[in-house]
Each structure stands twice: as structure tokens, then as C-alpha cells.
């Protein structure tokens, strides 16, 4: 091992304070005791150390805790967290939501880094499920967090956690993810009355089956076109013209602008043209009068 440089006389740090920002890297290495640093980590964030100085402080902690930092240190890492690698973080056992919040705060405003992703993974695995408080915290910092999870990971989200989800948290979710989230949302909001229920369930409807859409059409919900366009095509196809008209209410006029896009295009192809004509929107492409319409499932049975 290389012999370490001795600390110059009078420079031995008695505590972590602003005077250390004027220490050269080798002076920090020589004059700051690792145990002192560990007990006063809460001060590091209030001191504008350079990135090079933070490297030295990290090295001291790594030497003190080769098996991974204790949570008392992790909670106060502050900007030093940005120096950690995913490998470092995998050694940690983070159990406190306060610790998680403190570290997410450091990365606030930036994309989710590999370090943050590893930290979240360690935290959620440690808890066993995505409870409401955790989900609340994660979506507050990363609105797209929920949609970054696989359907398998989403299956561990308890229905009670769905209350923490905001519409923007689901913006980037694909149908497979909404298929998992929708039944949980339905369960979470089941005791709400009609209009309140629709407001809450609306963002999740991309995972709704046909029978639930039919039920909603009986409740004067006036679904907007943006929501309708996110519905599963296979769920929309069996809806009748009358049901779609009731589902959309005054927004039904928006179908004309979307007639070339799925699911509207595919739905139009399944409707009788004379039924479409009753809407008075000039929708074209329906089944001409007199043609036999076979249900898809029936066609499969026949073939």
C-alpha cells in the first residue's frame, strides 16, 4: 500500500465545516477522519465541495464501509449520492421512505439515472410491494415511473396505492400496463358515485373491457375523444353506435376528425352504415345495408 501523506500541522479537521472547501484533495484525504465524516454527513450537503473533493470524501466512506453504507450515512449523502455507482447502491439496505425522498431530492429535475433506478429497485424489493406512500413519493419525483414498470412488477401494486396515481403518471403507459392497472383502479374506486368514479377511473380506461364501457355508456359520462382514442380496440369494436353516442355525449362530433385513426376506423368498419348515418356526422366506411354481419368469434367457430 502506498504510504499516505501526513496531515500538515494544525489542519486536522475537528469537524466538517466550510473551512474544508479550501483544503486540497490530498489534505482532505490526510486530515479528515472517515469516522468523523460518517457522523457528520448531514453537513456535507451544506458545503459547496467541488466534484473532486466529493470524490475524496466518497473514497473515505468506501474504505470505512466496504460492505455498503449504513442507512444513517445514506440518508445524509446529499450531493455525494451523485457520485455513487449502481454497484455501490446494490450494497445498501434502504428501508426508510425519508431516506429515499432525501436522495430523490438530490436528483430532482433530471431524468431517472441508473443510480436512482437501482435505488428505487432496492427500496421496493426491500418493502415487498409498492405501497401507497412509496408510489406517492416516486410519482411525485418521476411522473412516468409507473409506466416504466413491467406488467409483472405492476401486479404487486395494491389497489389502495392507486389513489396516489395522477392522470399524468399514466401518460406513457402502454395497453399491457393499463390491463394490469385498470382492475386495481376499478376495485380502488368502486365505492364512489357515478360522476366522481368516472373522473378517477378515466385515466385507466385504456385497460377497460367492453362490458365496462357498455356500463359507462349508461351513466351519461361524456367521455372526451382523447380518452376514447386510448381505449383498447378490441374493447371498442363490439360497442353499438347508440352505445358510443351515449358514451361520448356531446363529444361524439369528434369522431369525424378521428375516422381514419384507430380505434375509430376499426369500429366504423364494424358498424352498419345506416346506424352510422343516424349520427349525422358523415362517417363513411360502415357495412352497406343488406350485408350479413357475422360476429368475429362466430366466424372463427365456423371456419
Amino acid at each position: 500500500e502506498v504510504e499516505k501523506t501526513a496531515c500538515p500541522s494544525g489542519k486536522k479537521a475537528r469537524e466538517i465545516d466550510e473551512s474544508l472547501i479550501f483544503y486540497k484533495k490530498w489534505e482532505l484525504e490526510a486530515c479528515v477522519d472517515a469516522a468523523l465524516l460518517a457522523t457528520q454527513m448531514d453537513r456535507v450537503n451544506a458545503i459547496p465541495f467541488t466534484y473532486e473533493q466529493l470524490d475524496v470524501l466518497k473514497h473515505k466512506l468506501d474504505e470505512l464501509y466496504p460492505q455498503g453504507y449504513p442507512e444513517s450515512v445514506i440518508q445524509h449523502l446529499g450531493y455525494l449520492f451523485l457520485k455513487m455507482s449502481p454497484e455501490d447502491i446494490r450494497k445498501w439496505n434502504v428501508t426508510s421512505l425519508e431516506t429515499l425522498k432525501a436522495l430523490l431530492e438530490v436528483n430532482k429535475g433530471h431524468e431517472m439515472s441508473p443510480q436512482v433506478a437501482t435505488l428505487i429497485d432496492r427500496f421496493v424489493k426491500g418493502r415487498g410491494q409498492l405501497d401507497k406512500d412509496t408510489l406517492d413519493t416516486l410519482t411525485a419525483f418521476y411522473p412516468g415511473y409507473l409506466c416504466s414498470l413491467s406488467p409483472e412488477e405492476l401486479s404487486s401494486v395494491p389497489p389502495s396505492s392507486i389513489w396516489a396515481v395522477r392522470p399524468q403518471d399514466l401518460d406513457t403507459c402502454d395497453p399491457r400496463q393499463l390491463d394490469v392497472l385498470y382492475p386495481k383502479a376499478r376495485l380502488a374506486f368502486q365505492n364512489m358515485n357515478g360522476s366522481e368514479y368516472f373522473v378517477k377511473i378515466q385515466s385507466f380506461l385504456g385497460g377497460a373491457p367492453t362490458e365496462d364501457l357498455k356500463a359507462l355508456s349508461q351513466q351519461n359520462v361524456s367521455m372526451d375523444l382523447a380518452t376514447f382514442m386510448k381505449l383498447r380496440t378490441d374493447a371498442v369494436l363490439p360497442l353499438t353506435v347508440a352505445e358510443v353516442q351515449k358514451l361520448l355525449g356531446p363529444h361524439v362530433e369528434g369522431l369525424k376528425a378521428e375516422e381514419r385513426h384507430r380505434p375509430v376506423r376499426d369500429w366504423i368498419l364494424r358498424q352498419r352504415q345506416d346506424d352510422l348515418d343516424t349520427l349525422g356526422l358523415g362517417l363513411q366506411g360502415g357495412i352497406p345495408n343488406g350485408y350479413l354481419v357475422l360476429d368475429l368469434s362466430m366466424q372463427e367457430a365456423l371456419s
Epitope: E15, D17, E18, S19, I21, F22, Q40, A46, I47
Partner: antibody, heavy 117, light 110 residues
Framework: EVQLLESGGGLVQPGGSPRLSCAVS????????MSWVRQAPGKCLEWVSA????????YYADSVKGRSTISRDNSRNTLYLQMNSLRAEDTAVYYC??????????WGQGTLVTVSS | QSALTQPPSVSGSPGQSITISCTGT?????????VSWYQQHPGKAPKLMIY???KRPSGVSNRFSGSKSGNTASLTISGLQAEDEADYYC??????????FGCGTKLTVL
Amino acid sequence: EVQLLESGGGLVQPGGSPRLSCAVSGFTFSSYTMSWVRQAPGKCLEWVSAISGSGGNTYYADSVKGRSTISRDNSRNTLYLQMNSLRAEDTAVYYCAKVGRAALDYWGQGTLVTVSS
Amino acid sequence: QSALTQPPSVSGSPGQSITISCTGTSSDVGSYNLVSWYQQHPGKAPKLMIYEVSKRPSGVSNRFSGSKSGNTASLTISGLQAEDEADYYCSSYTSSSTVVFGCGTKLTVL
């Protein structure tokens, strides 16, 4: 909410020794360096002294070195400045301030010390 | 440690931009990115507006910005408003772990 409240000012005879206090709330007092800054009537701000989180390190401006002692009681969340041998030029509003990222991020409303016979 | 040098006064009309300079030495402003700016309204405590040369504390309008070149730091206020009228002080941390202030600049909004 961070709050700093100074007290102990008033009229002091030349050569007097007032002790200023600053009661603090709203943050973890023991984790932060604290500072005293003064402002003579119509004059510049002048940094006076600072003390590190647990009181191990203290720093003074040349103008008060040897005549003032900064201290803190972390159990009471209170900062002190003991001033001795006061002169007319020490007349000023004295502010206590919290040091964050090497800047004074929160200040009290100040306490006026007037040195006059 | 001598005070940092600031112009005694600057003025500007509402909506305009103004810049206040703060000149130090190589042992304070020039050596470290530890320059702060404070706003002080008459009879009030100073308020931190900029720290570490160009960073804004939360709650401070983005009309306030800071920069540094060599031994001189600058505070720029854009879209001047009546409530910006105040005294502005710069300060720098020094290598002797002390703080040095400027003598302040009185900003008048015409």
C-alpha cells in the same frame, strides 16, 4: 419555517460587554455553521464571526478578534455573541444568519446595539 | 480583508434590465465560485438572492441572475419591477474562512 430571533441589544456604555442571543427554529441547528453580521447606521454590511455546527471551529473578523466570543448551545437551539470592550464604532444592527452552501441563506431581523455614554 | 467594490447606485425603468458589478481580488471573488448576492429593503433583514455565483434559492424570481468573470461578479435583474428597488450587496467567502461584503448598491426603479 426557518426563524431566527435576535435579542440582547440596547444602549451600552463604552467598554461595556453585552451578550447577544439568537433563538433558532425550523431546521436542524446543530448541522449548520452560524454567523453574525453587523450593519452600522447607513453603512455597509460587515461580517463579524462564524461558528461551525458543533462549535469546534470559530472564525472572527479582524475588527472584533480578541474582543468577541461566538458560541452556541445546540440543546437550546441558540447562538450567542459575547462582546467586550465596546467602542462607538461597534454601534450597529447585529444580525444572526444561517450558513448554507457558503452563503447566508436565512437572516434574523436584527438587534440594535448602541454604544454611547 | 478589504470590502468588495460595488457602484454606489444604479437605476432603470420598469421592464428594463440592469447589471450591478462586484469587484474583488484573486483571494476571494477570483479564486472561488462562492459569490452571493443579497437584497435589502429599508429597515428589513437582507435576503439571499444568488449563491455560488449563479444559483438561485427556491422562491427567488428567475429575473435575477448572476455571473462571474475573473475577479468581477455581476448581478443582472431583467424585467425590472417597482419592488426590486432596494440595496444589493455582494459577498464572497475567502480562503481564511471569513466572509467579505461589498458596500452595497442602491437600485432605483424610475
